[in-house]
Interface confidence: low
């Protein structure tokens, strides 16, 4: 516990004039001047009516104001003569005296009131010396402390009852105890009076010291009956931007150049790389110009920057598709969350006067266009004989924080002529016992002027193929067997060569006994 404080309500040691307490009967206690152990002059009371039996001598102090105190302590200094050392005394000689108190709301006592007896006076204790003395000049001073309470009225009197002792009351001090204001767990607790009983625990509410915050509530400390603090409950801790100092009684602001991101008892730390503070009490260090923190970065992480451009972009064009490959940037910006984006631009016009615009949505990127972790991408569905610019951007977790666009490396390419794409679905317009009339849509991507179409067909049961060429996107196949199934495929041709065949489709000729041609039969997929 912490040191207890004692506050005096009354102390005879400092009284130099008469005490003028009330004694009853007047032949009992007598006020005399004397000296304390340090030979300072003091006022004392003595009684020594030992040769007379049936003594009942009372002494009452002046009125003592209570000051909201619930329990009062009385320190008595006295000497007692050893009954055996006094000649010619009856057996009623005592070596003890009694301590009483009486509560009142004002100074109402008189020579006859309250009545000189236990009840109305409240007995505190019978006081016995540790040592009595046999010779008048060799008196040993006894010191005794007693307490009483709870008190409720405005003040009280102390009273001393002698029943036949030879003694001197050297000093009387009435005081109370309180717990001194203290700092514990970064919280301040005020000076607090002790409770009504020696075992009482008085709750003192706490407040966090400056620059501290509560970490557990409620904040309280208990003041015990001896004026000592015990059982702390709750605690504060230094707020962000502050560190413990002066044996945990202060929270000191972090000096410039340091910070503390979390509340607690940890110290301020130097700013992480690429950051600084310009004022004290920083909970985070601000990033240097062109350095940033991502939203997911903690306050104690270094500030980082955007990556430099990718290096060594290589293109490998194959007709209307290409593969781009590149190397890692020289500078990753201090981060490990590097990604790549590939921006496609289609260019029109010649040389330096060309204008470029974003590519069409049908351009395909494998594995993807944005957020690549790989340093390779396959790009297809480009237009033939067209100039393109591809920008390979390097980005990381702070690219979105930078006001500047991502850094990139660009490569210019021109596509070659490509063969036409696949012919879509074939349709049957009519069939007879010996012929099939078919049509089809041109390829989605002709990649040039279509010169003609080649059709491959065979009877399903035989598998020997025949071919026929058509300048139009329809054809009539003649000389077929009746009631037979035929598998048909078509492909388109440009100057770049043939495209891929369409998917195989099945059609049937009609029976010879049928009544003419059957119209618009749907294709039968394999």
């Amino acid at each position: 516990g912490c040191r207890a404080l004692e506050e005096t309500l009354m102390d005879t040691k400092w009284v130099t004039s008469e005490l003028a307490w009330t004694s009853h009967p007047e032949s009992g206690w007598e006020e005399v001047s004397g000296y304390d152990e340090a030979m300072n002059p003091i006022r004392t009371y003595q009684v020594c009516n030992v040769r007379e039996s049936s003594q009942n001598n009372w002494l009452r102090t002046g009125f003592i104001w209570r000051r909201d105190v619930q329990r009062v302590y009385v320190e008595l200094k006295f000497t007692v003569r050893d009954c055996n050392s006094i000649p010619n005394i009856p057996g009623s000689c005592k070596e003890t005296f009694n301590l009483f108190y009486y509560e009142a709301d004002s100074d109402v006592a008189s020579a006859s009131s309250p009545f000189w007896m236990e009840n109305p006076y409240v007995k505190v204790d019978t006081i016995a010396p540790d040592e009595s003395f046999s010779r008048l000049d060799a008196g040993r001073v006894n010191t005794k402390v007693r307490s009483f309470g709870p008190l409720s009225k405005a003040g009280f009197y102390l009273a001393f009852q002698d029943q036949g002792a030879c003694m001197s009351l050297i000093s009387v001090r009435a005081f109370y105890k309180k717990c001194a204001s203290t700092t514990a767990g970064f919280a301040l607790f005020p000076e607090t009076l002790t409770g009504a009983e020696p075992t009482s625990l008085v709750i003192a509410p706490g407040t966090c010291i400056p620059n501290a915050v509560e970490v557990s509530v409620p904040l309280k400390l208990y003041c015990n009956g001896d004026g000592e603090w015990m059982v702390p409950v709750g605690a504060c801790t230094c707020a962000t931007g502050h560190e413990p100092a002066a044996k945990e009684s202060q929270c000191r602001p972090c000096p410039p150049g340091s910070y503390k991101a979390k509340q607690g008892e940890g110290p301020c730390l130097p700013c992480p790389p690429n950051s600084r503070t310009t004022s004290p009490a920083a909970s985070i260090c601000t990033c240097h110009n062109n350095f940033y923190r991502a939203d997911s970065d903690s306050a104690d992480s270094a500030c980082t920057t955007v990556p430099s451009p990718p290096r060594g972009v290589i293109s490998n064009v194959n007709e209307t598709s290409l593969i781009l490959e590149w190397s890692e940037p020289r500078d990753l910006g201090g981060r490990d969350d590097l990604l790549y984006n590939v921006i496609c631009k289609k260019c029109h016009g010649a040389g330096g006067a060309s204008a470029c615009s974003r590519c069409d949505d049908n351009v395909e990127f494998v594995p993807r266009q944005l957020g690549l972790t790989e340093r390779r991408v396959h790009i297809s569905h480009l237009l033939a004989h067209t100039r393109y610019t591809f920008e390979v951007q390097a980005v990381n977790g702070v690219s979105g924080k930078s006001p500047l666009p991502p850094r990139y490396a660009a490569v210019n390419i021109t596509t070659n002529q490509a063969a036409p794409s696949e012919v879509p679905t074939l349709r049957l317009h009519s069939s007879s016992g010996s012929s099939l009339t078919l049509s089809w849509a041109p390829p989605e991507r002709p990649n040039g002027v279509i010169l003609d179409y080649e059709m491959k067909y065979f009877e399903k049961s035989e598998g020997i193929a025949s071919t026929v060429t058509s300048q139009m996107n329809s054809v009539q196949l003649d000389g077929l067997r009746p009631d037979a199934r035929y598998v048909v495929q078509v492909r388109a041709r440009t100057v770049a060569g043939y495209g891929q065949y369409s998917r195989p489709a099945e059609f049937e000729t009609t029976s010879e006994r049928g009544s003419g041609a059957q119209q618009l039969q749907e294709q039968l997929p394999l």
């Epitope: 915050v213 509560e214 970490v215 557990s216 707020a239 962000t240 979390k262 509340q263 607690g264 939203d295 997911s296």
Partner: antibody
Framework: EVQLQQSGAELARPGASVKMSCKAS????????MHWVKQRPGQGLEWIGY????????EYNQKFKDKATFTADKSSSTAYMQLSSLTYEDSAVYYC??????????????WGQGTSVTVSS | DIVLTQSPLSLPVSLGDQASISCRSS???????????LEWYLQKPGQSPKLLIY???NRFSGVPDRFSGSGSGTDFTLKISRVEAEDLGVYYC?????????FGGGTKLEIK
């Protein structure tokens, strides 16, 4: 006084989407993260994820990654959660809850009254 | 995912009794920063959950001191020293140390 006021009950068909709101008052909306919690009828609580209204940074429970989308409107101090491709399993009460911090995290300290979602054909 | 197992599922008590609820995690829930983000919530019938305890043993503002939390690593306990009528409901433990954050299955505190 801190308050989180959630939007009213929703009735939706399987496959549809719903978007519920959580309006914050009594504190600085952008200073505290907002969490979402699911409670099926008569069941326990399930954490869906959270959003930082200041930066729109989100973190989802993987289980709800394709189900829930969090957004926040700083001007109206309102957090939103959209649930998509609803199934009967999504019928539940959904709570928004503020993540308390006083220098450091101390729990989900204030909760909305909940929005009931019923999926029925 | 970390699984929090609460026991018992149901806890019948008399008013004034002490109640104790256990919460066990499938692995340690000490965060890399050294804190243990284990909380306790109470959900009364027809109401939203309310925070009681955070970081294992810290009582949230306004929570009576008859509620106390303890434990470390994987074993945690909520104690109510003298149960009052207003304490009845379902108690959930919750960990916020590792994503996804998870709740325990709940313990229903009811009158015997």
């Amino acid at each position: 006084e801190v308050q989180l006021q959630q939007s009213g009950a929703e009735l939706a068909r399987p496959g549809a989407s719903v978007k519920m709101s959580c309006k914050a008052s009594g504190y600085t909306f952008t200073s505290y993260w907002m969490h979402w919690v699911k409670q099926r009828p008569g069941q326990g609580l399930e954490w869906i994820g959270y959003i930082n209204p200041s930066s729109a940074y989100t973190e989802y429970n993987q289980k709800f990654k394709d189900k829930a989308t969090f957004t926040a409107d700083k001007s109206s101090s309102t957090a939103y959660m959209q649930l998509s491709s609803l199934t009967y399993e999504d019928s539940a009460v959904y709570y928004c809850a503020r993540e308390g911090k006083y220098g450091s995290y101390y729990g989900l300290d204030y909760w909305g009254q909940g929005t009931s979602v019923t999926v029925s054909s | 995912d970390i699984v929090l197992t609460q026991s018992p599922l149901s806890l019948p008590v008399s008013l004034g009794d002490q109640a104790s609820i256990s919460c066990r995690s499938s692995q340690s829930i000490v965060h890399s920063n050294g804190n243990t983000y284990l909380e306790w919530y109470l959900q009364k019938p027809g109401q939203s959950p309310k925070l009681l305890i955070y970081k294992v043993s810290n009582r949230f503002s306004g929570v009576p001191d008859r509620f106390s939390g303890s434990g470390s690593g994987t074993d945690f306990t909520l104690k109510i020293s003298r149960v009052e009528a207003e304490d009845l409901g379902v108690y959930y433990c919750f960990q916020g140390s590792h994503v996804p954050w998870t709740f325990g299955g709940g313990t229903k505190l009811e009158i015997k």
